[in-house]
Amino acid sequence: QPDAINAPVTCCYNFTNRKISVQRLASYRRITSSKCPKEAVIFKTIVAKEICADPKQKWVQDSMDHLDKQTQTPKT
């Protein structure tokens, strides 16, 4: 889980090892602040929980790509 050390900076100290279906993910944000120990991706799930993930992992990159495309596609 992400940890807000000094709001508004949120950092990730551990990443999930578990691969998660993109269909459980609603959105994401990148953590690139120099105040944080490592770059990270925070996924928000369909039930509004937040998960720290490693942006170097393929499933994380694929999930971000999928969510990007989902955002770009207008709903009919």
């Epitope: 999930t16 998660i20 279906s21 993109v22």
Partner: antibody
Framework: QVQLVQSGAEVKKPGASVKVSCKVS????????MHWVRQAPGKGLEWMGG????????IYAQKFQGRVSMTEDTSTDTAYMELSSLRSEDTAVYFC????????????WGQGTLVTVSS | DIVMTQSPDSLAVSLGERATINCKSS????????????LVWYQQRPGQPPKLLIY???TRESGVPDRFSGSGSGTDFTLTISSLQAEDVAVYYC?????????FGQGTKVEIK
């Protein structure tokens, strides 16, 4: 392809504990979210608990809280489910179950382990 | 917790005839942002673990014959076997996977008339 192989049948006395194992191959256990589902004779499927990556921890069905423990040995890629204070109603087949990308349903199942609780 | 209720509890159908199983959830399992229903169907033959048939309410798992189909949205779902075969004798379960705890229907036993 994930494969799950469970330990053999057990007979236990009321009040005892049982520990069922589930050996993973084809994946490492830490990539998967392992869950446990049981089925009493002639009855339906009942989710007991498992690792939920959305919570970052193992979660348990309220019914089993305090009586069940689900653990992992990452060195052997083996998951364990231990149920204590056994009673006759715990007689059931216990399944481990998972999928490659956690979504909340199960496309890989162990073969099942029959636990019989009898005095 | 979301309660899943299946109907009927059992049904007997002639070979080659249609079998229909219903599943109702106590609250919606539709996520409107992706328009997906978080519902699956399993088949369980005697002495075997459950086998995934259908996920996202209507997507057939690979290798599942096309006589099996899933439909419905929100709270009401249906599994249809269009032409019952002898190997389809089993218990069928629905399960919601929107919210934990993950919950199953009580099962529907399908037999040959």
């Amino acid at each position: 392809q994930v494969q799950l192989v469970q330990s053999g049948a057990e007979v236990k006395k009321p009040g005892a504990s049982v520990k069922v194992s589930c050996k993973v191959s084809g994946y490492t256990l830490t990539e998967l979210s392992m869950h446990w589902v049981r089925q009493a004779p002639g009855k339906g499927l009942e989710w007991m608990g498992g690792f939920d990556p959305e919570d970052g921890e193992t979660i348990y069905a309220q019914k089993f809280q305090g009586r069940v423990s689900m653990t992992e040995d990452t060195s052997t890629d083996t998951a364990y489910m231990e149920l204590s204070s056994l009673r006759s109603e715990d007689t059931a087949v216990y399944f481990c179950a998972t999928n490659e990308f956690w979504s909340g349903y199960f496309d890989y199942w162990g073969q099942g382990t029959l636990v019989t609780v009898s005095s | 917790d979301i309660v899943m209720t299946q109907s009927p509890d059992s049904l007997a159908v002639s070979l080659g005839e249609r079998a229909t199983i219903n599943c109702k959830s106590s609250q919606s399992v539709l996520y409107s942002s992706n328009n997906k229903n978080y519902l699956v169907w399993y088949q369980q033959r005697p002495g075997q673990p459950p086998k995934l048939l259908i996920y996202w309410a209507s997507t057939r798992e690979s290798g599942v014959p096309d006589r099996f189909s899933g439909s419905g949205s929100g709270t009401d779902f249906t599994l249809t076997i269009s032409s019952l075969q002898a190997e389809d004798v089993a218990v069928y379960y629905c399960q919601q996977y929107f919210y934990s705890p993950w919950t199953f229907g009580q099962g529907t036993k399908v037999e040959i008339k």
